[in-house]
């Protein structure tokens, strides 16, 4: 329906109607990340699978070069989960030094980029201090909320450390958006 | 409306419209779990309250025998939270042995079952190593994402250890889905 | 469209249709909290930004005095994330006493208040024991689910300790709802 109005002669329609199945939607799943150069003060962006397995894009929502492209203005629900995992060295020498082989924190940010505006906008952030004491640790950070987006906006997911992202399963790390 | 088209004679309609209130929806809440036999390599499934308190199913979305039944094909947002809790023995004997009375990890999986195929498909997984040191620990795992489902698909929630699930309050542990 | 029916003379319509852009929606973001008196057995409610930055309310969904007001009956998806942060004193005296300067737990509750009913209803709860051992700790709790609400219902977010809420960034702590 793409927003066309239903307006029989006897009735005034005030807002466009559309079929729900026609709305832009995407669910992207994790892939193995290739090391990429990133700016000093910006977390690296993840790239994603967009058509194999559980991943899909539809109705003009496209994925390209780490970005989800918003094809029409409106209110979108945006979500992501990133599962982090790492190894903590347990040797007494390292533990005494107080610097086990683990990050101090893990962070996920869903970011909006608008071509007409130089600075990206952080829409959602999940950040957690890491105090695991076992030799192997893993945990997810989940985010989801509704935002008003404009046609042409681009969305990406940034993380504090790409090397800690669990890319082994499509159900553990994912990113999606749909027009409400 | 169940997908019927609005097509006044002067206007071509390209996709079915439907009333939002007519869409399949469910929000299920936790109940005390009865110990059940489960296969060696598969996490046990939770069963749920589907009509008391905050729980409901509507518009042909039915709950039966641990499964949510998908009544029509389409894109669904599916979510669940499971709150886990446990006791960690603090006795020096156990702590010296390095094996406190707690799991190494906690995991929630939202799984899809298709009748034509015996193997379930894991849609969402939240998994976390447990390194709590206090005597009582508790924490939620939340999951939510959008999936394309087929009429007849069944959804369930599996957990790594049913005995650790907090079933005391309907707001702590829940499972839901709705057609977009 | 506000629910009005499309009913050309030759066709019976069984449920109201409406434009999606016409539905009540809100996304609220964190502000610095002013200390408020709260009842002994009830967690304090957060107040929110509703129009600056990423925050908005639309289509008769209003925010007033810590509450989101539901303008029409229907099924709503409701979500919130609260990021908590604190300092843990590391002095040997405190650590030996086993009572570092941190809470035993952190909790978020999304609560519904109905004027005709004296007791608030807890819709969603995320609660987590805190066992951080570092000097600074921080972590989010995310909640989201679908509920059937009535016109006039009010929603609020309660937390176990307002002083631990991270109010520094709108993407860390937020609260939203939208009619499905």
């Amino acid at each position: 329906l793409k927003g066309q109005e239903f307006a029989p002669s006897h009735q005034q329609v005030y807002a466009p109607l559309r079929a729900d199945g026609d709305k832009p939607r995407a669910h992207l799943t994790v892939v193995r990340q290739t090391p990429t150069q990133h700016f000093k003060n910006q977390f690296p962006a993840l790239h994603w699978e967009h058509e194999l397995g559980l991943a899909f894009t539809k109705n003009r929502m496209n994925y390209t070069n780490k970005f989800l492209l918003i094809p029409e203005s409106g209110d979108y629900f945006i979500y992501s989960q990133v599962t982090f995992r790492g190894m903590t060295s347990e040797s007494s020498e390292i533990r005494q030094a107080g610097r086990p082989n683990k990050p101090d924190s893990i962070t996920v940010v869903i970011t909006k980029v608008t071509d007409s505006y130089p600075e990206p906008t952080q829409l959602l952030m999940g950040t957690k201090s890491v105090s695991e004491v076992g030799s192997n640790w893993f945990q997810p950070i989940y985010l989801g909320a509704m935002f008003s987006l404009q046609e042409g906006d681009k969305l990406m997911v940034n993380v504090s450390d790409i090397s800690l992202v669990d890319y082994t399963k499509e159900d553990k790390t994912f990113f999606g958006a749909f027009l409400l | 409306l169940k997908g019927q088209e609005f097509a006044p004679s002067h206007q071509q309609v390209y996709a079915p419209l439907r009333a939002d209130g007519d869409k399949p929806r469910a929000h299920l809440t936790v109940v005390r779990q009865t110990p059940t036999q489960h296969f060696k390599n598969q996490f046990p499934a939770l069963h749920w309250e589907h009509e008391l308190g905050l729980a409901f199913t509507k518009n042909r979305m039915n709950y039966t025998n641990k499964f949510l039944l998908i009544p029509e094909s389409g894109d669904y947002f599916i979510y669940s939270q499971v709150t886990f809790r446990g006791m960690t023995s603090e006795s020096s004997e156990i702590r010296q042995a390095g094996r406190p009375n707690k799991p190494d990890s906690i995991t929630v999986v939202i799984t899809k079952v298709t009748d034509s195929y015996p193997e379930p498909t894991q849609l969402l997984m939240g998994t976390k190593s447990v390194s709590e040191v206090g005597s009582n620990w508790f924490q939620p795992i939340y999951l939510g994402a959008m999936f394309s489902l087929q009429e007849g698909d069944k959804l369930m929630v599996n957990v790594s250890d049913i005995s650790l699930v907090d079933y005391t309050k309907e707001d702590k542990t829940f499972f839901g889905a709705f057609l977009l | 469209l506000k629910g009005q029916e499309f009913a050309p003379s030759h066709q019976q319509v069984y449920a109201p249709l409406r434009a999606d852009g016409d539905k009540p929606r809100a996304h609220l973001t964190v502000v610095r909290q002013t200390p408020t008196q709260h009842f002994k057995n009830q967690f304090p409610a957060l107040h929110w930004e509703h129009e600056l930055g990423l925050a908005f309310t639309k289509n008769r969904m209003n925010y007033t005095n810590k509450f989101l007001l539901i303008p029409e009956s229907g099924d709503y998806f409701i979500y919130s994330q609260v990021t908590f942060r604190g300092m843990t004193s590391e002095s040997s005296e405190i650590r030996q006493a086993g009572r570092p300067n941190k809470p035993d737990s952190i909790t978020v509750v999304i609560t519904k208040v109905t004027d005709s009913y004296p007791e608030p209803t807890q819709l969603l709860m995320g609660t987590k024991s805190v066992s951080e051992v570092g000097s600074n700790w921080f972590q989010p709790i995310y909640l989201g689910a679908m509920f059937s609400l009535q016109e006039g219902d009010k929603l609020m977010v309660n937390v176990s300790d307002i002083s631990l809420v991270d109010y520094t960034k709108e993407d860390k702590t937020f609260f939203g709802a939208f009619l499905l």
Epitope: L52, Y167, T168 | - | -
Partner: antibody, heavy 124, light 107 residues
């Protein structure tokens, strides 16, 4: 048992059309994509088209785009290849093949289940 | 499109021989490469996926290696049932493309 069975091949005149079918059984049809691959007599394998049975996304070999259309019917666990404006060089055995995906970001998998093939002959 | 070039086009070998087939991509395909075996009149069979992973039921004498643009399929000790044509396929970019094939014949 996981199985793919092609049908619909035959003799057709140049410029004609043919619709091939592929019936799938023994697995979750909506999870794995499916490709059509063809092999002309005495030649190697040539990838033709792919469809996501999950959401209907498609890809085609560049030379065939516009003439060939891949589609699916999830309710019937079936896949189709509509071939129009056929030419002599389209003569081949046509296979449908399941695109295994391991649900892991580490792997792209391969075509792990193949049908027996159906022969298409374009000749006047 | 990514071009896949196999070498040799054909080879003759004896039972027990170690056989190596190479596949070169015109641009990097990461590790997204599969190997197939095809016998006359039969459908192809998946041997190796993602450059080095053996498919279910494939004997351990088959192994794959490589990443980027250069890949190798090795049969450590050729068996009578291994005489067939072998194809590589890149799965990095659409359209998927196959190599032209390598025919392994009995010496």
């Amino acid at each position: 048992e996981v199985q793919l069975v092609e049908s619909g091949g035959g003799l057709v005149q140049p410029g004609g059309s043919l619709r091939l079918s592929c019936a799938a059984s023994g697995y979750d049809f909506t999870y794995y994509g499916i490709s059509w691959v063809r092999q002309a007599p005495g030649k190697g394998l040539e990838w033709v088209a792919w469809i996501s049975t999950y959401n209907g996304n498609t890809h085609y070999a560049r030379m065939l785009q516009g003439r060939f259309t891949i589609s699916r019917d999830n309710a019937k666990n079936s896949l189709y290849l509509q071939m129009n404006s056929l030419r002599a060089e389209d003569t081949a055995v046509y296979y449908c093949a399941r695109e295994n995906y391991y649900g892991s970001g580490a792997y792209r998998g391969g075509m792990d289940v193949w049908g027996q093939g159906t022969t298409v002959t374009v000749s006047s | 499109d990514i071009q896949m070039t196999q070498s040799p086009s054909s080879l003759s070998a004896s039972v027990g021989d170690r056989v190596t087939i190479t596949c070169r991509a015109s641009q990097s395909v990461s590790s997204y490469l599969a190997w197939y075996q095809q016998k006359p009149g039969k459908a192809p069979k998946l041997l190796i996926y993602d450059a080095s992973n053996r498919a279910t039921g494939v004997p351990s004498r088959f192994s794959g290696s490589g990443s980027g643009t250069d890949f190798t399929l090795t049969i450590s000790s050729l068996q009578p049932e291994d005489f067939a044509t072998y194809y590589c396929q890149q799965r990095s970019n659409w359209p998927w493309t196959f190599g032209q094939g390598t025919k392994v014949e009995i010496k």
